[in-house]
């Protein structure tokens, strides 16, 4: 059995599959920072966990992908006010009784000290200096990520 | 290049309702808040309320109770209404882009409307 | 919310430097790193010069620049040219159905 948020989740991770390939993206959008091999994009407005996922989807990007400490340390460094929380692409599935990322992998527990109670209806968010789980349905910022394309040097054949 | 035009009548009556409709050209309306901003003569610019374009709205709370905004995703449109208007609501009226919820990086013209009977 | 205090002008030679202050409270501008700045000439829409306190858009001199301490944000313009000649307002987040503008700031170049 699937919450609402995990349908949702789903559905527009789905519809993201599903569009057409565009071409890559070398430079970050105006107002969009780079973090190594993406583009980040922190809202100024708040939203609930499923909105921000669609706001982001809107945006032809996602909710913010952490692969580890060291990129959750340089994403914390971009935030400048420290009481401020931003969601990130990972929500609770209770099916799977387990935290789990928009692209459908499993949080590895050695990722994120998590702040706060696993349980339903339960959404990651971080701030400057910690990860916290809140209510799904709380308002607060959010993060976007577009993942650039890494340029090729072209390799020519010795003449 | 992002153009923002005003349309509406530029006399209202009092009492009545102030509609006024912004058309965005030369880009998407789309993932965007767009705002309505005005100014009454020789004074300082006031917030109104903004918009997205998934239909979200936030207005200054002092004018929640008269004001209703709407967009049209597919004319490229977004409108206000704001009833029970007043002298003091006689002000130069703008729109503008408000890519991230807090500044206004593309400002339409302005247009100004008068309260008088 | 009132509006944010500025002084109601500011003068400076062609070649100067002018600072404009912008004074809130820890709700908004000292609240947020959302205070953005606009110049607007008679008669015309205000155009965005400075946002997220000390951002440039593209077009924008680099003669303007921003700063925040505290509950007060500040403009400043070197190198002041004729074109500078314009009212100033800053601007700053201060809850999801907020936003306030300063009284505004006259810039004279003398």
């Known amino acids: 059995q699937k919450s609402s948020i995990e349908k949702c989740s789903v559905d527009i991770q789905q519809s993201r599959n599903k569009t057409t390939e565009r071409p890559g993206l070398l430079n970050c959008p105006i107002y969009w920072q780079q973090l190594r091999e993406k583009c980040l994009l922190f809202s100024h407005t708040v939203n609930p966990w499923n909105n921000s996922l669609a706001d982001c989807s809107t945006k032809e990007s996602s909710l913010l992908l952490i692969r580890d400490k060291d990129e959750l340390i340089h994403t914390q460094n971009l935030i400048r006010d420290k009481a401020i929380l931003f969601w990130i692409g990972l929500n609770f599935s209770l099916s799977e009784k387990n935290w789990k990322w928009i692209n459908g992998s499993f949080l590895n527990s050695n990722d994120l000290e998590i702040r706060g109670d696993a349980k339903e209806n339960s959404c990651i968010s971080i701030s400057q200096t910690s990860v916290y789980s809140e209510y799904c349905s709380t308002e607060i910022r959010w993060i976007c990520q577009k993942e650039l394309t890494p340029v090729r040097n072209k390799v020519y054949p010795d003449s | 290049q992002v153009q923002l035009q005003e349309s509406g009548p530029g006399l209202v009556k009092p009492s009545e309702t102030l509609s006024l409709t912004c058309t965005v050209s030369?880009?998407?309306?789309?993932?965007?808040?767009w705002s309505w901003i005005r100014q009454p003569a020789g004074k300082g610019l006031e917030w109104i309320g903004r918009?997205?374009?998934?239909?979200?709205?936030n207005f200054k709370p002092s004018l929640k109770s008269r004001v209703t905004m709407s967009v049209d995703t597919s004319k490229n449109q977004f409108s206000l209404k704001l009833r029970s208007m007043t002298a003091a609501d006689t002000a130069v009226y703008y729109c503008?882009?408000?890519?991230?919820?807090?500044?206004?990086?593309?400002w339409g013209q302005g247009t100004l409307v008068t309260v008088s009977s | 919310q009132s509006a944010l205090t500025q002084p109601p002008s500011a003068s400076g030679s062609p070649g100067q430097s002018v600072t404009i202050s912008c004074t809130g409270t820890?709700?908004?501008?000292?609240?947020?790193?959302?205070v953005s700045w606009y110049q607007q000439h008679p008669g015309k829409a205000p155009k965005l010069m400075i946002y997220e306190v000390s951002k440039r858009p593209s077009g924008v001199p680099d003669r303007f620049s921003g700063s925040k301490s505290g509950n007060t944000a500040s403009l400043t313009v070197s190198g002041l040219q004729a074109e500078d000649e314009a009212d100033y307002y800053c601007?700053?987040?201060?809850?999801?159905?907020?936003?306030?503008f300063g009284t505004g700031t006259k810039v004279t170049v003398l």
């Open positions: 601007s700053s987040y201060a809850d999801i159905n907020n936003l306030v």
């Open positions: 030369g880009g998407s309306i789309s993932s965007y808040y």
């Open positions: 503008a882009r408000d890519p991230l919820g807090s500044f206004f990086d593309y």
């Open positions: 820890s709700s908004d501008v000292g609240g947020y790193n959302y």
């Open positions: 918009i997205y374009t998934s239909g979200s709205t």
